[in-house]
Amino acid sequence: IIPVEEENPDFWNRQAAEALGAAKKLQPAQTAAKNLIIFLGDGMGVSTVTAARILKGQKKDKLGPETFLAMDRFPYVALSKTYSVDKHVPDSGATATAYLCGVKGNFQTIGLSAAARFNQCNTTRGNEVISVMNRAKKAGKSVGVVTTTRVQHASPAGAYAHTVNRNWYSDADVPASARQEGCQDIATQLISNMDIDVILGGGRKYMFPMGTPDPEYPDDYSQGGTRLDGKNLVQEWLAKHQGARYVWNRTELLQASLDPSVTHLMGLFEPGDMKYEIHRDSTLDPSLMEMTEAALLLLSRNPRGFFLFVEGGRIDHGHHESRAYRALTETIMFDDAIERAGQLTSEEDTLSLVTADHSHVFSFGGYPLRGSSIFGLAPGKARDRKAYTVLLYGNGPGYVLKDGARPDVTESESGSPEYRQQSAVPLDGETHAGEDVAVFARGPQAHLVHGVQEQTFIAHVMAFAACLEPYTACDLAPRAGTTD
């Protein structure tokens, strides 16, 4: 199965010489970035990137690891230290605060410095930190948020919200005492904290009053509106902008994205998180790639540029379930969105960053043969004389005892999208991991992304590259042809 040409040293020497030639030609751009895009793979640690690369290659009937992901083509790479102020291993709220606002916070808080305390409403005021997206809006750019989770979820919320509890999606989730103290739910903050031009993802139910049936699942009461304050936040948002449009399915999204009269677009395609890519009804729900394209079509109309946050948010969910098939297929769709965005933008004026908020206790090992399925078994048996998969988790729901022992596994089981890879420790949900994650960069000022950095550095690179606060005196030449 090994390609014959790879047995020849010339193959590797020639390949490396080409890579070296490309590296020698890299020239740091001295211009400012007109546009900023941050692609956030939630839970996309380096082991996830590697396994997804192999799967993407195998999907194309190649052996696997020799394939390039779209993110692999970005010329600059750094490592990001993901810890939060109070935890070695962080959550998506504290990390969002770091890479979107440039300040580290505490576990499960969003858009607040570490002086704020989880779940303590009265520690909110005065501890708010401002996102790069907010600063981009103040500078006259258009801004957008795209995610496969709820738009009120921790990662996207870092772009616009300030909350001591990431779980306060709608007012029904906020304790009465906190509501009385003035703490607002995340959905309310989505429409009131700042003017966001494009909002695409899941999370319909948090926007509508309790008892409002969902348009897609009208007979399922649990999918309907959750709000106790009687507010229709979508209606309130539409009333703010003459060119605003709300859509809830793929067809409407594609129409709206091509309509020149639409200036603001909100698309909420599921009551909660969007479906996994493998379960998505492609007639009703758009893919992450399609949402990204729609957002770029609208945002790129602004001559002053744009800021766009794009999240592959369910990579994380697949890992928490210990279902590597789900995590990896979500990662591939995330990478497809990166590739599409690259086709629709220019690296001359657009700084694109790809990173993860944190990793997962997901491993890839066992000396599998080249070309063997990424979902397959390691050669040979373990000490208990049973097979084991090359993909495993350190902890999680994949820990199962059968007759007091680890169950055997066959290849026909391990390939199933429902299969949970085994783990060493039993938990209801697999956990995040604390190792550094990669940051990939391309475009103006991408060369600043180097070395081992705090996660907060990401927000500062974006702000500096686009000459946003606090770097308005950035002393970067505007790109030729940039209009104001």
């Epitope: 009937d61 063997s372 979902f375 290849e411 390939g415 199933s416």
Partner: nanobody, 121 residues
Framework: QVHLVESGGGLVQAGGSLRLSCAAS????????MGWFRQAPGKEREFVAA???????EYADSVKGRFTISRDNAKDTVYLQMNSLKPEDTAVYYC???????????????WGQGTQVTVSS
């Protein structure tokens, strides 16, 4: 989800031919590699043939030159043309789908219910 439904099995004499079909329910059928496996009574399920997204094809040594796999993306269907059948080809034949030929030939994601092929001598 991908639902797979096989058809075309039956009883045939040694040296005869059969054509198995497998219809898939998902619109993105062309993204998947498709394969056939078989399980004879009392034996493990074994790989027979697979056809990838790119059209690349693999066969088990035991069926090379006798069986031909093909696909019609417009009809979301994969076929297995079986010629020069032998009694040892008797088995339940399963259709499978996976992300690429490497995956489908080793660890398919989706399986059909199977169709019985019996070759009499």
């Amino acid at each position: 989800q991908v639902h797979l439904v096989e058809s075309g099995g039956g009883l045939v004499q040694a040296g005869g031919s059969l054509r198995l079909s497998c219809a898939a329910s998902r619109r993105s059928f062309s993204e998947y590699a498709m394969g056939w496996f078989r399980q004879a009574p009392g034996k493990e399920r074994e790989f027979v043939a697979a056809i990838g997204w790119s059209g690349v094809i693999e066969y088990a040594d035991s069926v090379k030159g006798r069986f031909t796999i093909s696909r019609d993306n417009a009809k979301d269907t994969v076929y297995l043309q079986m010629n020069s059948l032998k009694p040892e080809d008797t088995a339940v034949y399963y259709c499978a789908a996976g992300l690429g030929i490497r995956v489908v030939s080793q660890t398919p994601a989706y399986w059909g219910q199977g169709t019985q092929v019996t070759v009499s001598s």
